[in-house]
């Protein structure tokens, strides 16, 4: 708290300008009118105020707007946004994408802070869904944003928004998130031709079921090993050696280097050794010739 002291003669601020730069904390408190500050917030960002000075300016705005700042002030907060707490932000009603962009720009270079997370949450809830423009904006500032959402939150992403997603935006997504995003991506890209479709869908394939992988194997897609290694193990296991060979194309040789890692390891254990031998890669661990494979899960379903 800053003590209430009278403003020294001749120091009363008539506008927010560079003359305030060396005002001490108590001088800013005494000599700057909160209403003037609110109407000239855009000028604050042109002046290299210290953190200590920004604290005083925030305190003045808090006194003027105890129920939360109006959007006209929020849009021009600039570096003052860094001084806001999640509790402050929960009082706001941010509806303009321009306001969101302005505040994210201030936070550029910082990790996603609790303040930013709260701001985004308030904004998205206010909009009702994560529309394409919002998603575009958020992933531009925070490539990992999508993967920070729960599967439930991701379910509100309309398929049209998927066009804004770049491969790097999905780098940290786990299988549960990709399970939600993949069907949306499939729907979004459904009218594209084979090779273009594969380029777009590739980053989402960690959520693809077996039947879609089988379909892709018929299209000469030449999936790279990095993508293959991110596929769901349960989706890969039912694929035949021939289907994996077609799916990977020339990249099939990379299986040897990954034979001890999932899903390759688990897939090898499900294949007949003589089928694996047809690849000529020296993959070992398949089912020996002459052994009968019983699918117990199928047997249980029948009984």
């Amino acid at each position: 708290e800053v003590e209430k002291t009278a403003c020294p003669s001749g120091k009363k601020a008539r506008e927010i300008d560079e003359s305030l730069i060396f005002y001490k904390k108590w001088e800013l408190e005494a000599c700057v009118d909160a209403a003037l500050l609110a109407t000239q917030m855009d000028r604050v960002n042109a002046i290299p105020f210290t953190y200590e000075q920004l604290d005083v300016l925030k305190h003045k705005l808090d006194e003027l707007y105890p129920q939360g700042y109006p959007e006209s002030v929020i849009q021009h907060l600039g570096y003052l946004f860094l001084k806001m707490s999640p509790e402050d932000i929960r009082k706001w009603n941010v509806t303009s994408l321009e306001t969101l962009k302005a505040l994210l720009e201030v936070n550029k270079g910082h990790e996603m802070s609790p303040q930013v997370a709260t701001l985004i949450d308030r904004f998205v809830k206010g909009r009702g869904q994560l529309d394409k423009d919002t998603l575009d904006t958020l992933t531009a500032f925070y490539p990992g944003y999508l993967c920070s959402l729960s599967p439930e939150e991701l379910s509100s992403v309309p398929p049209s928004s998927i066009w804004a997603v770049r491969p790097q935006d999905l780098d940290t997504c786990d299988p549960r998130q990709l399970d939600v995003l993949y069907p949306k991506a499939r729907l979004a890209f459904q009218n594209m031709n084979g090779s273009e479709y594969f380029v777009k869908i590739q980053s989402f394939l960690g959520g693809a079921p077996t039947e879609d992988l089988k379909a892709l194997s018929q299209q000469n897609v030449s999936m790279d090993l990095a993508t293959f290694m991110k596929l769901r193990t349960d989706a890969v296991l039912p694929l035949t050696v021939a289907e994996v060979q077609k799916l990977l194309g020339p990249h099939v040789e990379g299986l040897k280097a990954e034979e001890r890692h999932r899903p390759v390891r688990d897939w090898i254990l499900r294949q007949r050794q003589d089928d694996l031998d047809t690849l000529g890669l020296g993959l070992q661990g398949g089912i020996p010739n002459g052994y009968l494979v019983l699918d117990l899960s199928m047997q249980e379903a029948l009984s």
């Epitope: 560079e18 003359s19 730069i21 060396f22 290299p48 105020f49 953190y51 604290d55 860094l82």
Partner: antibody, heavy 119, light 106 residues
Framework: QVQLVESGGGLVKPGGSLRLSCAAS????????MSWIRQAPGKGLEWVSY????????YYADSVKGRFTISRDNAKNSLYLQMNSLRAEDTAVYYC????????????WGQGTLVTVSS | IQLTQSPSSLSASVGDRVTITCRAS??????LAWYQQKPGKAPKLLIY???SLESGVPSRFSGSGSGTDFTLTISSLQPEDFATYYC?????????FGGGTKVEIK
């Protein structure tokens, strides 16, 4: 890209004067606060002086107050430091720096100019 | 506000994880910047607001801390990282620097 080029350094006797210049390019000079920072040989950094974008607000470190004058010519994209009554302890490399993010730290620095005060 | 850096110098090898600390004489929130200076060159801004990486600075550099204690970490030292590192506070005027930490080749 942003460029700051200092000049005017040299050898001067105690009590003498020098005027340093800093030519700026690659950004709108008149929009930004500028600073002079110095570094004595083998020593750390000391913030010497600060000038606002219009030139109306100025700061000096106590060690140079009354002897140094900072100024700028926005039409010429130039920053200046007039140094009078120089002392041996003013010997240092002098850097100009710009506050491009409009924050109180130094985003870009010039390469520096050496001022040596010695009899 | 005084800033005290430690150690004043250290020897390390390429690939090492290096940590430099900066202590403020009073609380400065997260108003701290870190600079790198190579011999005969101007300082270069690495980190601001205690932990924000300046554009173009490699991600092996990271900053942390708030209040009075701050840390600059280089996760895997590279040949070009041998230099002197300075902290600077901007919580209040006058702006002040730490005394520097020289990182030398072991």
């Amino acid at each position: 890209q942003v460029q700051l080029v200092e000049s005017g350094g040299g050898l001067v006797k105690p009590g003498g004067s020098l005027r340093l210049s800093c030519a700026a390019s690659g950004f709108t000079f008149s929009d930004y606060y500028m600073s002079w920072i110095r570094q004595a040989p083998g020593k750390g950094l000391e913030w010497v002086s600060y000038i606002s974008s219009s030139g109306s607000t100025i700061y000096y470190a106590d060690s140079v107050k009354g002897r140094f004058t900072i100024s700028r010519d926005n039409a010429k994209n130039s920053l200046y430091l007039q140094m009078n009554s120089l002392r041996a302890e003013d010997t240092a490399v002098y850097y100009c720096a710009v506050h491009l993010k409009r924050r109180p730290y130094f985003d870009y620095w010039g390469q520096g100019t050496l001022v040596t005060v010695s009899s | 506000i005084q800033l005290t850096q430690s150690p004043s110098s250290l020897s390390a090898s390429v690939g090492d994880r290096v940590t430099i600390t900066c202590r403020a004489s009073q609380g400065i929130s997260s108003a701290l910047a870190w600079y790198q200076q190579k011999p005969g060159k101007a300082p270069k801004l690495l980190i601001y607001d205690a932990s924000s990486l300046e554009s173009g600075v490699p991600s092996r550099f990271s900053g942390s801390g708030s209040g009075t204690d701050f840390t600059l970490t280089i996760s895997s030292l590279q040949p070009e990282d041998f230099a002197t590192y300075y902290c600077q506070q901007f919580n209040s005027y006058p702006l002040t620097f730490g005394g520097g930490t020289k990182v030398e080749i072991k």
